[in-house]
């Protein structure tokens, strides 16, 4: 089977600050130098692209200046980085990996990772 | 809503070319994939091509290399498919396909028709 | 490249009747990766399931998809006068994207 399996983990609790990291590891059936990973969000049966980044094999993943997201590429490895996250912003997103060159051309989508936020609770006012 | 509304085709002699658009629209164009798909009258599908998001990678079944070009301009939401040294096999009816951002084809153009006879 | 075969070629059903459409891969695909598509004459052809047995969107509950591997199903669990079509699978794992050569669903 040439098919391509993208692992990521079930469930990430955003941190306090609304950043949520996590790994998506996929099983490469080509010699790719050329990936795109997506990450997709799915609420009901929409899914809406969050951020996209295309990289060369051994070199930086870099996401447009304005992206949510960062990331760092190891092998087939991609840390992935969702920042500015807020409570409705709770849901379950998807990994997606593109070998986009050269051909075949592959697709690998991950079952999703849960990510909950929780909004922090405002600061007290304090009366000195 | 996504719309995609595809023109050019027409009858030609073998040899001759032809090419096709397809004016998108409803939807963030760049990050999508777009597809030809095509299907000789009375028969199945077949795909033809494809063109990634930026422009720069493409794939082509293997009975169109070197003869099919497919572009993209993301500033007009419009895909083309250059067709060279047309043959009577290439006669058909050519969607044009979004690739949804899960991959299967979600959304289908009404088809234009290409006949190459002489 | 993967060869999909459909099976059979033609089904004659009544309306109300249930509808089993088969679709065989030459090598073990993802079910993350197979897509059914309707076609009626004249007509584009329409996504109905995708991942193998998800419903795309405002597809009826009467259409289900199933299978893993190298076999797969479409199932119309009780077929509607509208539903009288061709059906194709897909699979969309790996270039070229390649198509069965489609099951017809007539009237008996």
């Known amino acids: 089977c040439k098919a391509m399996h993208v692992a990521q983990p079930a469930v990430v609790l955003a941190s306090s600050r609304g950043i949520a990291s996590f790994v998506c590891e996929y099983a490469s059936p080509g010699k790719a130098t050329e990936v795109r990973v997506t990450v997709l969000r799915q609420a009901d049966s929409q899914v809406t692209e969050v951020c996209a980044a295309t990289y060369m094999m051994g070199n930086e993943l870099t996401f447009l200046d304005d992206s949510i997201c960062t990331g760092t590429s190891s092998g087939n490895q991609v840390n992935l980085t969702i920042q500015g996250l807020r409570a409705m912003d709770t849901g379950l997103y998807i990994c997606k990996v593109e070998l986009m060159y050269p051909p075949p051309y592959y697709l690998g989508i991950g079952n999703g990772t849960q990510i909950y936020v929780i909004d922090p609770e405002p600061c007290p006012d304090s009366d000195f | 809503q996504v719309q995609l509304v595809e023109s050019g085709g027409g009858e030609v002699q073998p040899g001759r070319s032809l090419r096709l658009s397809c004016a998108a629209s409803g939807f963030t164009f760049s990050s999508y994939g777009m597809h030809w798909v095509r299907q000789a009258p009375g028969k199945g599908l077949e795909w033809v091509a494809v063109?990634?998001?930026?422009?720069?990678?493409?794939h082509y079944v293997d009975s169109v290399k070197g003869r099919f070009t497919i572009s993209r301009d993301n500033s007009k939401n419009t895909v083309y498919l250059q067709m060279n040294s047309l043959r009577a096999e290439d006669s058909a009816v050519y969607y044009c396909v979004r690739g949804g951002q899960l991959g299967a084809f979600d959304y289908w153009g009404q088809g234009t028709l290409v006949t190459v006879s002489s | 490249e993967i060869v999909l075969t459909q099976s059979p070629g033609t089904l004659s059903l009544s309306p109300g009747e249930r509808a089993t459409l088969s679709c065989r891969a030459s090598?073990?695909?993802?079910?993350?990766?197979l897509a059914w598509y309707q076609q009626k004459p004249g007509q584009a052809p329409r996504l109905l399931i995708y991942?193998?047995?998800s419903r795309a969107t405002g597809i009826p509950d009467r259409f289900s998809g199933s299978g893993s591997g190298t076999d797969f199903t479409l199932t119309i669990s009780r077929l509607e006068p509208e539903d009288f079509a061709v059906y194709y699978c897909?699979?969309?794992?790996?270039?070229?994207?390649?198509f069965g050569q489609g099951t017809k669903v007539e009237i008996k």
């Open positions: 897909q699979q969309y794992g790996s270039s070229p994207w390649t």
């Open positions: 991942g193998a047995s």
């Open positions: 090598q073990s695909v993802s079910s993350s990766y």
């Open positions: 063109i990634w998001y930026d422009g720069r990678n493409k």
